[in-house]
């Protein structure tokens, strides 16, 4: 025998009486599939979350993060504070990258400049808090009289962090 509730479309739920009447979802609730025994409570976008899509009787609300924050997790389940390029987020707030490290994103952590000499290359453009160094040809490849920028410390070795 077919479950009478299966006739209840999205946006409704199946009543508990003998007639199994399909009842519209109450305000601030939804059912996205047919045959549901109850409607789900709509997600509320509060605090650092803002509404991207309103809840309807057939679909949940969707949130994103307010300006100055970025989404993490499925369906933007978390919001994390942005920092500027050249910074990283700590518990005490956004801190500038230490000398010899950089961050080219508004999120994440600083990482060390590339050590060009590990690849036998020279530094063509110095690194900054926001940008990695640019490596150029090896010192031996440079024409007489040409000079390259001295590689900055700390050295970045693959598999190691600055301490």
């Amino acid at each position: 025998l077919q479950d009478p509730c299966s006739k209840c479309p999205a946006g409704t739920f199946c009543g508990k009486n003998k007639n199994q009447i399909c009842i519209p979802c109450p305000p601030n609730s939804f059912s996205s599939t047919s045959g549901q025994k109850a409607c789900d409570i709509c997600r509320q976008c509060k605090g650092v979350f803002r509404t991207r899509k309103e809840c309807s009787s057939t679909s949940n609300a969707e949130c994103d993060c307010t300006p100055g924050f970025h989404c993490l997790g499925a369906g933007c389940s978390m919001c994390e504070q942005d920092c500027k390029q050249g910074q990283e987020l700590t518990k005490k707030g956004c801190k500038d990258c230490c000398f010899g490290t950089f961050n080219d994103q508004k999120r994440g952590i600083c990482r060390p400049w590339t050590n060009c000499s590990l690849d036998g290359k020279s530094v063509l453009v110095n690194g900054t808090k926001e940008r990695d160094v640019v490596c150029g040809p090896s010192p031996a490849d440079l024409s007489p009289g040409a000079s390259s920028v001295t590689p900055p410390a700390p050295a970045r070795e693959p598999g190691h962090s600055p301490q």
Epitope: G73, S77, M78, K91, G108, I109, R111, S161, Q163
Partner: antibody
Framework: QVQLVQSGAEVKKPGESLKISCKGS????????ISWVRQMPGKGLEWMGK????????NYSPSFQGQVTISADKSISTAYLQWSSLKASDTAMYYC?????????WGQGTLVTVSS | DIELTQPPSVSVAPGQTARISCSGD??????AHWYQQKPGQAPVVVIY???NRPSGIPERFSGSNSGNTATLTISGTQAEDEADYYC???????????FGGGTKLTVLG
């Protein structure tokens, strides 16, 4: 939607080499850290290390430094964890996860069994 | 590196409050995060940055972090909360993530 899909279970002998993978999709793979986490049978989570796929910068837990190698190929949105010589004590579930502090997405795990 | 210590197990009756501690030197100076792991599944964030709850995680989950202890509190614990719980922190000394040893939460009855 964001997904991390790991390679299948492996059964190996001590001394053999192994490389397992974690393929990301649904986001800018190059600009998010990927971490690897070990869980030995019946035990807790252990953070092994992380990689920034954009430039393959890696950083290891002192406990795993020199024991494993983490790498990535951003052109195919894949991170790797490899061993050059497996030991029985490497038997564990290995998870990749997106992030360095808050791990918001996890792979389904790769079970590695090392037995003679 | 910082070491995070959790009680191996905590038992609680349904409807009661469960508290899981995570102790480490000055952990209050760093963000603490909490993960729930059920058998055969990958971990899931239940609290991030000390006290923030991801959407979809019930309001009964809350967190705090100061001094040497971070705490996960589950008010009105339900049977479905039975799982392993792990605290973690990212330390800017060594640039590493550390997990606590994990706590098995048992909901009695």
């Amino acid at each position: 939607q964001v997904q991390l899909v790991q390679s299948g279970a492996e059964v190996k002998k001590p001394g053999e080499s192994l490389k397992i993978s974690c393929k990301g999709s649904g986001y800018s793979f190059s600009t998010y850290w990927i971490s690897w986490v070990r869980q030995m049978p019946g035990k807790g989570l252990e953070w092994m290390g992380k990689i920034y796929p954009g430039d393959s910068y890696t950083n290891y837990s002192p406990s795993f430094q020199g024991q494993v190698t983490i790498s990535a190929d951003k052109s195919i949105s894949t991170a790797y964890l490899q061993w050059s010589s497996l030991k029985a004590s490497d038997t564990a579930m290995y998870y990749c996860a997106r992030g360095y502090g808050i791990f918001d997405y996890w792979g389904q795990g790769t079970l590695v069994t090392v037995s003679s | 590196d910082i070491e995070l210590t959790q009680p191996p197990s905590v038992s609680v009756a349904p409807g009661q409050t469960a508290r899981i501690s995570c102790s480490g030197d000055n952990i209050g100076d760093q963000y603490a995060h909490w993960y729930q792991q059920k058998p055969g599944q990958a971990p899931v964030v239940v609290i991030y940055q000390d006290k923030n709850r991801p959407s979809g995680i019930p309001e009964r989950f809350s967190g705090s972090n100061s001094g040497n202890t971070a705490t996960l509190t589950i008010s009105g614990t339900q049977a479905e909360d039975e799982a392993d719980y792990y605290c973690s922190t990212y330390t800017f000394v060594g640039f590493t993530t550390v997990f606590g040893g994990g706590t098995k939460l048992t909901v009695l009855g």
